[in-house]
């Protein structure tokens, strides 16, 4: 059973995994950021199902690409260089979901744009830390 | 039909530097990411970097970061690439391409004929 | 950066005949997302520019013939040339597209027995 320390530690992760996803979805919607238009062009994956901390697999495989996507946005719109971002939240995604477990993600059919990526996984974080209080 | 046609063959001395240029016709040079690539028959292909010609965005391979600076200038639907402090390692041809589709950053798709640049003395 | 090695570094054929040309990468180019591997294979004859023949490791680029096909998944892909043609002599490139730097095999010199 997790004791109070661990699901404080997971719950801290999840806050620190919520505010990296929310410092990128600002940068991106920043009414100076010329490149939206360009970004939401780009295609990424959901997951069927994301209620789970093993869900985290799904965005842990579409961090890769979300790399890509963010090496588009003037850097000045985010604080770290998008390899430092993605690796902060690749460390994160690691530690949350656990290497233990081989959990096999399965897709939804339909495509994201990078706002509704974005907003998926900041709606799972919101979700499990509000369980986890 | 989309065409990049670049500019010709260029003589240059170890340490000068030089500019070569790319320009887009068929579609709208800010649509797309141009990428430029490196040829020497010895060392095959490598990639330099890309530009984004709507704001001038540019991402270089680490190798390339001192040596290519790449711009754009929307208004003659064209990109430039300026090689600096030019050694013999240099001479090579060098292609502009563009990305196929903007629903990723690659692959190439579209290829200018190429620039062959020789440094010698 | 993924490294790509390609394999053979020439390659002596006839015409008519089948030819195999490999590519490994050190990480898998599989985007589980859509199940596409973004890997892709050039041709580059002597005094040309590259020319895209294969993207995503099996889908032909319009207007390639389809003697070239490309497959494979992962970390280890092939290109398969059936029916060699003259004009097929070149070199050819594989090309991981994934991840910034893109990065190119080797190169493979395709030549006449």
């Known amino acids: 059973a997790p004791t109070s320390s661990s699901t404080k530690k997971t719950q801290l992760q999840l806050e620190h995994l919520l505010l990296d996803l929310q410092m990128i979805l600002n940068g991106i919607n920043n009414y100076k950021n010329p490149k939206l238009t360009r970004m939401l062009t780009f295609k990424f994956y959901m997951p069927k199902k994301a209620t789970e901390l093993k869900h985290l697999q799904c965005l842990e495989e579409e961090l890769k690409p979300l790399e890509e996507v963010l090496n588009l946005a003037q850097s000045k719109n985010f604080h770290l260089r998008p390899r430092d971002l993605i690796s902060n939240i690749n460390v994160i995604v690691l530690e949350l979901k656990g290497s233990e477990t081989t959990f096999m993600c399965e897709y939804a059919d339909e495509t994201a744009t990078i706002v509704e990526f974005l907003n998926r996984w900041i709606t799972f974080c919101q979700s499990i830390i509000s369980t986890l209080t | 039909e989309i065409q990049l046609q670049q500019s010709g063959p260029e003589l240059r001395r170890p340490g000068s530097s030089v500019k070569l240029s790319c320009k887009a016709s068929?579609?709208?040079?800010?649509?797309?990411?141009i990428h430029w690539v490196r040829h020497r028959p010895e060392h095959g292909l490598e990639w330099i970097g890309w530009?984004?010609?709507?704001?001038?965005?540019?991402r270089y391979a680490q190798k390339f970061q001192s040596k290519a600076t790449l711009t754009a200038d929307t208004s003659s639907n064209a990109a430039y690439m300026q090689l600096s402090s030019l050694t013999p390692e240099d001479t090579a041809t060098y292609f502009c391409?563009?990305?196929?589709?903007?629903?990723?950053?690659?692959?190439?798709?579209?290829w200018g004929q190429g620039t062959l640049v020789t440094v010698s003395s | 950066d993924i490294v790509m090695t390609q394999s053979p570094f020439s390659l002596a054929v006839s015409e008519g005949e089948m030819v195999t040309i490999n590519c490994k990468s050190s990480?898998?180019?599989?985007?589980?997302?859509?199940?596409?591997?973004?890997l892709a294979w050039y041709q580059q004859k002597p005094g040309q520019s590259p020319k895209l023949l294969i993207y995503?490791?099996?889908t032909g680029q319009s207007g390639v013939p389809d003697r070239f096909i490309g497959s494979g998944s992962g970390t280890d892909f092939t290109l398969t040339i059936s029916d060699v043609q003259a004009e097929d002599l070149a070199d050819y490139y594989c090309?991981?597209?994934?991840?910034?730097?893109?990065?190119f095999g080797a190169g493979t010199k395709l030549e006449l027995k």
């Open positions: 391409a563009r990305q196929l589709d903007s629903t990723y950053i690659y692959p190439f798709a579209y």
């Open positions: 068929g579609y709208n040079i800010t649509d797309y990411l």
């Open positions: 530009i984004d010609p709507e704001d001038g965005e540019t």
């Open positions: 990480q898998s180019l599989l985007r589980s997302g859509n199940q596409k591997n973004y």
């Open positions: 995503y490791a099996s």
């Open positions: 090309l991981q597209h994934y991840i910034t730097p893109p990065t």
